[in-house]
């Protein structure tokens, strides 16, 4: 699997999950989130050659098409597969509120 | 929706489904398929700016991150959303066999 365990410990050039830290205030302009100040969101990057963690029958066909037509702009793309939630704390007036934000952290990628 | 109805009738530059015909023999090297000779597989292409058909909470965050960090390599990617099957005919000896290949035709795209 193209997950953090494999990708963070390798120098994989093909589609893999990469490290990305997002600061809520600086990177998103969300000043009102109290905790955390930011988080390891990660992102997916890298080419999707034929047979590399292909998602569907279509992505297999497209990767094969790409192999036969190397100059074509049609190619599978490296995108998130498994996503995890992130808990945040913010204040409504003086009252702290905890919320679980779904699908915020990339754990693995796929070629789609 | 970034589907064939919208995308094929517009000059949309952002993420949209594009026309792509795949010839089984020439483009994939699959000589054994009897019918059809090829099919309109289509593909997804175009940038994924802020708020353009974003798939998950993560893709919204990443698009916003990209807005604040325009030079960053972390950005959502235009990939298939709705896929349709394709029926094919091939021969096993003299006996024709019909098979439904799932997820072969792109009908719409999303930013993931």
């Amino acid at each position: 699997a193209l997950d953090t365990n494999y990708c963070f410990s390798s120098t994989e050039k093909n589609c893999c999950v990469r490290q990305l830290y997002i600061d809520f205030r600086k990177d998103l302009g969300w000043k009102w989130i109290h905790e955390p100040k930011g988080y390891h969101a990660n992102f997916c990057l890298g080419p999707c050659p034929y047979i590399w963690s292909l998602d569907t029958q279509y992505s297999k066909v497209l990767a094969l098409y790409n192999q036969h037509n190397p100059g074509a702009s049609a190619a599978p793309c490296c995108v998130p597969q498994a996503l995890e939630p992130l808990p945040i704390v913010y204040y409504v007036g003086r009252k702290p509120k905890v919320e679980q934000l779904s699908n915020m952290i990339v754990r693995s990628c796929k070629c789609s | 929706a970034l589907d064939t109805n919208y995308c094929f009738s517009s000059t949309e530059k952002n993420c949209c489904v594009r026309q792509l015909y795949i010839d089984f023999r020439k483009d994939l090297g699959w000589k054994w398929i009897h019918e059809p000779k090829g099919y309109h597989a289509n593909f997804c292409l175009g940038p994924c700016p802020y708020i353009w058909s974003l798939d998950t909470q993560y893709s919204k965050v990443l698009a916003l991150y990209n807005q604040h960090n325009p030079g960053a390599s972390a950005a959502p990617c235009c990939v298939p959303q709705a896929l349709e099957p394709l029926p094919i005919v091939y021969y096993v000896g003299r006996k024709p066999k019909v098979e439904q290949l799932s997820n072969m035709i792109v009908r719409s795209c999303k930013c993931s």
């Epitope: 998103l28 302009g29 969300w30 000043k31 009102w32 913010y90 204040y91 409504v92 007036g93 003086r94 009252k95 509120k97 919320e99 934000l101 779904s102 | 802020y50 708020i51 909470q57 919204k60 965050v61 916003l64 807005q67």
Partner: antibody, heavy 121, light 107 residues
């Protein structure tokens, strides 16, 4: 230029629901809280609640007894306020107003033009 | 809930004079070194517009004839060299405690 454009005036029967829209432009919709404020004829301003459009987080004023529902469509940068079980006391101009951006509860720096809701049998 | 009381309820001022409006909160609206008090003007037939943010910060594009002061529970909005265009209803608003609340207005 930041703009908040609200839907037109509504006339509703008692017990019915009303849904007011607020289409935004000129700023990044998922970066700011959107508030809803109402003003009865000749009266002051009442804060109804707020939504953070990025993931739909909401905070409501208990005064509205669970009758108000706030939603947002990020694909069209539009916020919605639905008020149910309408009664004569709900006759008012309803405003959407963008939060300033430093806190969840905050000042409001841009306002829609207002939507008059009339309740009449 | 924090109750905001404005005085006077209405005010008539001659051009070029100074107007003062008071707003008293039922409890302190100070937290983390800020006073969570803001001022708005609603001109006839229009939506409210933000004048002063966090008790004393002039909102961008607003005339410097408007100024705000105060802390804790007592706040004041001053309008110097009053113009006819300043006519309307002025509201104070607190966001230190949920629910956010407004004063009843000064005309």
């Amino acid at each position: 230029e930041v703009q908040l454009v609200q839907s037109g005036a509504e006339v509703k029967k008692p017990g019915a629901s009303v849904k007011v829209s607020c289409k935004t432009s000129g700023y990044t919709f998922i970066k700011y809280w959107m508030n809803w404020v109402r003003q009865a004829p000749g009266a002051g301003l009442d804060w109804m609640g707020q939504i953070f459009p990025a993931w739909g987080s909401t905070n409501y004023n208990e005064m509205f007894e669970g009758r108000v529902t706030l939603t947002a469509d990020t694909s069209t940068s539009t916020a919605y306020m639905e008020l149910s079980s309408l009664r004569a006391g709900d006759i008012a101009v309803y405003y959407c107003a963008r939060g300033y951006g430093n806190y969840a509860l905050d000042a409001m720096d841009y306002w829609g033009q207002g939507t008059l809701v009339t309740v009449s049998s | 809930d924090i109750v905001m009381t404005q005085t006077p309820p209405s005010l008539s001022v001659s051009p070029r004079e100074t107007a003062s409006i008071s707003c008293r909160a039922s409890e302190s609206v100070d937290s983390y070194g800020n006073s969570f008090m803001h001022w708005y003007l609603q001109k006839p037939g229009q939506s409210p517009q933000l004048l002063i943010y966090l008790a004393s910060n002039l909102e961008s594009g607003v005339s410097d004839r408007f100024s705000g002061s105060g802390s804790g529970t007592d706040f004041t909005l001053r309008i110097s060299r009053v113009e006819a265009n300043d006519t309307g209803v002025y509201y104070c608003q607190q966001n230190d405690e949920d629910p956010l609340s407004f004063g009843q207005g000064t005309k």
